[in-house]
């Protein structure tokens, strides 16, 4: 890379001194190698997030499984390969366990608590709510450039949005990727949703001056508000039944 | 058939300034991203500019910033770039490009350009 | 970076396979064929490798790392010409051409 950088990821340390003068790029937080030729894992994007703090409806119902992330930021423990461990813990040593976008899905324990696996997000509804316009957007517009985005600056192949819904002001989009079905190139599905969810708030991760430009036939879409949703292959475990907003 | 027609070039004075336009057709040109590039007689071929599809982002070569502008006309389906200030190191043919990936995070990058013009030729001279 | 690391020249006999380098960037590339000064050049890949449909299924792209590549299997004779290869210059958050490639067919 030109001067060293990581264009993915503007949350790393990166040098020339690793073999042969090779620009390499590290999480920050984490110290751990990340590849900048695609998205970096959501879990080491949010420790280096919180290092740099130290320092018909045709809109679709959620599952009653469905889980929004109220719980916010925490710091999380990753693997060797960037992914979130299945159990985290804070400083007090209260615990949980997380499914693989790194979203608290059963109650907090103690130290105790045993995780055994970490359950993957297959299914991730994206909520968007825009800001009003002189005319309603044209759903078939809307599909083709939101499906656009995904596929050309996350690099998601198309296979894994599912369906775009809209149903003025709001607009749905489904995000589905079982285990099976990802390749070992393929971008996950979240850490699509974060680096989306980030791009949005106008904290974009990518190094580059060039923002989100999202726009239907001209119209740009300017969002309001958002709330993501995450469905796991297993249901969560919380000892209350509750769908949670957030 | 996608096409991509330049036209303003011819002999400019230095110091003056200029208006080349693009003329588009066979594509829907308010979905693209735009470049002008250029190439000095016998030299390679140098990046210019680019703009977004709703002219809200543009970016500019070190040799042209501060001289140059780039907008569109989506209604008109036309790219311009105004350049002043003009030098004798400004001659050469410039071309106007399509971008294939708008959204991309490198969407400046040369590597998306998927269609270009003919070129119309400057030449700054006294 | 003042321009993307390509070999000057690289010279084959018809029917060889060529393959021409391009560093440097930190984003896509794209190769840019020119047989004579002037006259605009033919994109023959575009984002890495995307090869455009009026262009023979010889030429192909790809990219390791940082590194992109054209190759040519079985290069004939109307192959020789210039290539440039063109990309993302991370440092200034632009675009940027190597300096080209003379691709002599012996």
């Known amino acids: 890379q030109s001067n060293c950088t990581c264009p993915t990821n503007k949350m790393t340390v990166c040098d020339t001194n690793g073999p042969g003068g090779v620009c390499q790029c590290r999480a920050m937080g984490s110290q751990v190698l990340v590849d900048c030729s695609t998205l970096t894992s959501k879990c080491l994007l949010l420790k280096a997030r919180m290092s740099a703090r130290k320092s018909g409806r045709s809109l679709v119902m959620p599952s009653e499984h469905a889980i929004l992330d109220n719980d916010g930021l925490y710091d999380p423990e990753c693997d060797d390969k960037g992914r979130f461990k299945a159990r985290q813990c804070n400083q007090t040593s209260v615990c949980w366990c997380v499914n693989s976008v790194g979203v608290r899905r059963t109650d907090k324990g103690d130290q105790s608590l045993r995780c055994d696996e970490v359950v993957r997000t297959h299914h991730i509804l994206i909520e968007l709510r825009h800001r009003p316009t002189d005319r309603a957007f044209n759903h078939s517009d809307l599909d083709s450039e939101l499906r656009r985005l995904f596929q050309e600056r996350y690099k998601l192949h198309p296979s894994f949005l599912s369906a775009v819904h809209y149903e003025e002001p709001t607009i749905q989009i489904e995000l589905r990727q079982n285990a099976s079905q990802k390749g070992l190139r393929d971008v996950d599905i979240a850490d699509a949703a974060y680096y989306f969810e980030r791009d949005i708030k106008g904290e974009s991760l990518f190094m580059g001056r060039r923002g989100l430009d999202v726009q239907v036939r001209g119209e740009p879409l300017h969002v309001e508000r958002t709330l993501i949703y995450y469905l796991d292959e297993k249901p969560p475990q919380f000892s209350m039944k509750r769908l949670t907003a957030g | 058939a996608v096409t991509l027609d330049e036209s303003g070039g011819g002999l400019q004075t230095p110091g003056g300034g200029l208006s080349l336009v693009c003329k588009a057709s066979g594509f829907d040109f308010i979905d693209y991203d735009m470049f002008w590039v250029r190439q000095a007689p016998g030299k390679g071929l140098e990046w210019v500019a680019v703009?977004?599809?709703?002219?809200?982002?543009?970016n500019y070569a070190p040799a042209v910033k501060g001289r140059a502008t780039i907008s569109r006309d989506n209604g008109q389906s036309t790219l311009r770039l105004q350049l002043n200030n003009l030098r004798a190191e400004d001659t050469g043919t410039y071309y106007c490009?399509?971008?294939?990936?708008?959204?991309?995070?490198?969407?400046?990058?040369?590597?998306?350009?998927?269609?270009w013009g003919h070129g119309t030729e400057v030449i700054v001279s006294s | 970076a003042l321009a993307l690391t390509q070999p000057s020249s690289v010279s084959a006999n018809p029917g060889e396979t060529v393959k021409i380098t391009c560093s440097g960037g930190?984003?896509?590339y794209g190769w840019f064929q020119q047989k004579s000064p002037g006259i605009a050049p033919v994109i023959v890949i575009f984002n890495d490798d995307n090869r455009p449909s009026d262009i023979p299924s010889r030429f192909s792209g790809s990219k390791s790392g940082s590194t992109g590549t054209l190759t040519i299997t079985g290069v004939q004779a109307e192959d020789e010409a210039v290539y440039f290869c063109?990309?993302?210059?991370?440092?200034?958050?632009?675009?940027?051409f190597g300096a080209g490639t003379t691709l002599t067919v012996l």
């Open positions: 930190s984003g896509s």
């Open positions: 490009a399509r971008g294939a990936c708008t959204h991309c995070w490198d969407a400046d990058s040369a590597g998306y350009i998927d269609t």
């Open positions: 703009i977004n599809r709703s002219g809200s982002y543009t």
């Open positions: 063109g990309g993302y210059d991370g440092s200034t958050d632009a675009g940027i």
